[in-house]
């Protein structure tokens, strides 16, 4: 054996962010020499599951028929060939939505904003939470985090954007979460359409999509500017 076996590829279908009760399939793809595939979950001492490879032996399927809190977490997979075990795959973070009631997403002063001006997206939850996430549909990097610095829980988080450009236009949702498991998110807020006027092209409403929709290449990572709001929350860009 020349060196360590190449690591397999791990992914989830229809995506890695799954609503409570929905089904998800985790795939691990190795090589044609694989004899067994193993899926490990972080903090689980025993192999989380193991499967024979599907023909032609280069991948295995791990099915979750109904998503619950217990399945949310960080996974890695391995395969075993005649010469031993592979390196672990890159981690897959399986996130469940629907763990808490949905927050409300609004735009201040208005969801209709002129290019070059400022707007703040406000995500509000009924109960205090310590993490808020803003997602722009079809963005290449959809997650923006605002997380409490000292575990102090908040009812809301502000996502300021300044100056606004055409890139900021689109459909947004937000989620809230507790810090003890960032793999468990609330139900999504109702969508908010941010319309930026004064741009070269007319804004077109984006269709409502599930969070697990693959990122489109057309959108740049959303990077709101401006000062961090005085809410005890720290901004994290994912």
């Amino acid at each position: 054996q020349a060196g360590p076996l190449p690591k397999p590829t791990l992914w989830a279908e229809p995506g890695s962010v799954i609503s409570w009760g929905n089904s998800v399939t985790i795939w691990c793809q190795g090589t044609l020499e694989a004899r067994e595939y193993r899926l490990d979950k972080e903090e689980s001492p025993a192999p989380w599951d193991r499967q024979n490879p599907l023909e032609p032996k280069n991948k295995a399927r791990f099915s979750i028929p109904s998503m619950t809190e217990d399945y949310a977490g960080r996974y890695r997979c391995y395969y075993r060939s005649p010469v031993g075990w592979s390196q672990p795959s890159d981690p897959l973070e399986l996130v469940m939505t629907g763990a808490y009631s949905k927050p409300t997403l609004s735009a201040l002063p208005s969801p209709l904003v002129t290019s070059g001006k400022s707007v703040t997206l406000l995500c509000q939850s009924r109960s205090p939470m310590d993490t808020f996430l803003l997602i722009k549909e079809r963005a290449a990097h959809p997650l923006l985090h605002l997380r409490s610095e000292h575990g102090a829980q908040q009812h809301q988080a502000e996502f300021p954007m300044s100056p606004v450009t055409s890139v900021h236009g689109g459909t947004y949702r937000c989620f809230s979460s507790h810090g003890f498991s960032h793999y468990l998110l609330s139900h999504p807020s109702d969508p908010l359409e941010l319309i930026v006027s004064g741009s070269l092209e007319d804004p077109r409403p984006s269709p409502t999509r599930s969070v697990s929709t693959a990122a489109g290449p057309e959108d740049q990572p959303l990077m709101p500017t401006g000062s961090v709001p005085h809410s005890g929350l720290r901004r994290h860009w994912e």
Epitope: S44, A46, W48, D49, N52, P82, V83
Partner: antibody, heavy 124, light 107 residues
Framework: QVQLVQSGAEVKKPGASVKVSCKAS????????MHWVRQAPGQGLEWIGE????????NYNEKFKTRATLTVDTSTSTAYMELSSLRSEDTAVYYC?????????????????WGQGTLVTVSS | DIQMTQSPSSLSASVGDRVTITCRAS??????LNWYQQKPGKAPKLLIY???RLHSGVPSRFSGSGSGTDYTFTISSLQPEDIATYYC?????????FGGGTKVEIK
């Protein structure tokens, strides 16, 4: 010390179901998969299936997939094997057995502890 | 499923004899081969895993070797307490499968 204590002998009629229990002690129940193996009188060993007590994931021998159901109760560290639609050929000693990693190196797994066995007799 | 063929099905040997049992798999099992000892009326007991590794507490007179499809189990010096049936078992692919067993008796 590791112990797997199984329920007592059962006599069942053809078509009935049987549920065998296996109470584990002396180790962390959720850290090891539990296997079930049977042995007909004077015969060899036959694997039925396995269950991960930490999440309930199961794998079955195709031969038993439609008739065997493996479950666990983590609150009592007990594993169960239920076999339905019993026939005379199911008369056997049923064993639960702990499966886990043995060597320090990744991938050396085997059944290292067994229950004492439960005799299930299927007779009309 | 992988078929495991064990031979002989029974043997009789004297105390102190060297005893050898063979196990052949229907396909390459990459050394994922375990050996168990079962005494009458008792549950099986793990002796050797991964072809040649001695399980903790198992006497060193027991040993294993092999690769690919052909594997061997040896008792270097048979003792009265070794009277039992011995089973090989492959752990290379699901489902795990066992050999038919070899019954060892004292002459």
């Amino acid at each position: 010390q590791v112990q797997l204590v199984q329920s007592g002998a059962e006599v069942k009629k053809p078509g009935a179901s049987v549920k065998v229990s296996c109470k584990a002690s002396g180790y962390t129940f959720t850290n090891y998969w539990m296997h079930w193996v049977r042995q007909a009188p004077g015969q060899g060993l036959e694997w039925i299936g396995e269950i991960n007590p930490s999440n309930g994931r199961t794998n079955y021998n195709e031969k038993f997939k439609t008739r065997a159901t493996l479950t666990v109760d983590t609150s009592t560290s007990t594993a169960y094997m239920e076999l339905s639609s019993l026939r005379s050929e199911d008369t056997a000693v049923y064993y639960c057995a702990r499966w886990g990693q043995l060597g320090l190196r990744e991938g050396y797994y085997a059944v290292d502890y067994w229950g004492q066995g439960t005799l299930v007799t299927v007779s009309s | 499923d992988i078929q495991m063929t064990q031979s002989p099905s029974s043997l009789s040997a004297s105390v102190g004899d060297r005893v050898t049992i063979t196990c052949r798999a229907s396909q390459d099992i990459s050394n994922y081969l375990n050996w168990y000892q079962q005494k009458p009326g008792k549950a099986p007991k793990l002796l050797i895993y991964y072809t040649s590794r001695l399980h903790s507490g198992v006497p060193s007179r027991f040993s294993g070797s092999g690769s690919g499809t052909d594997y061997t189990f040896t008792i270097s010096s048979l003792q009265p307490e070794d009277i039992a049936t011995y089973y090989c078992q492959q752990g290379n692919t699901l489902p795990p499968t066992f050999g038919g067993g070899t019954k060892v008796e004292i002459k």
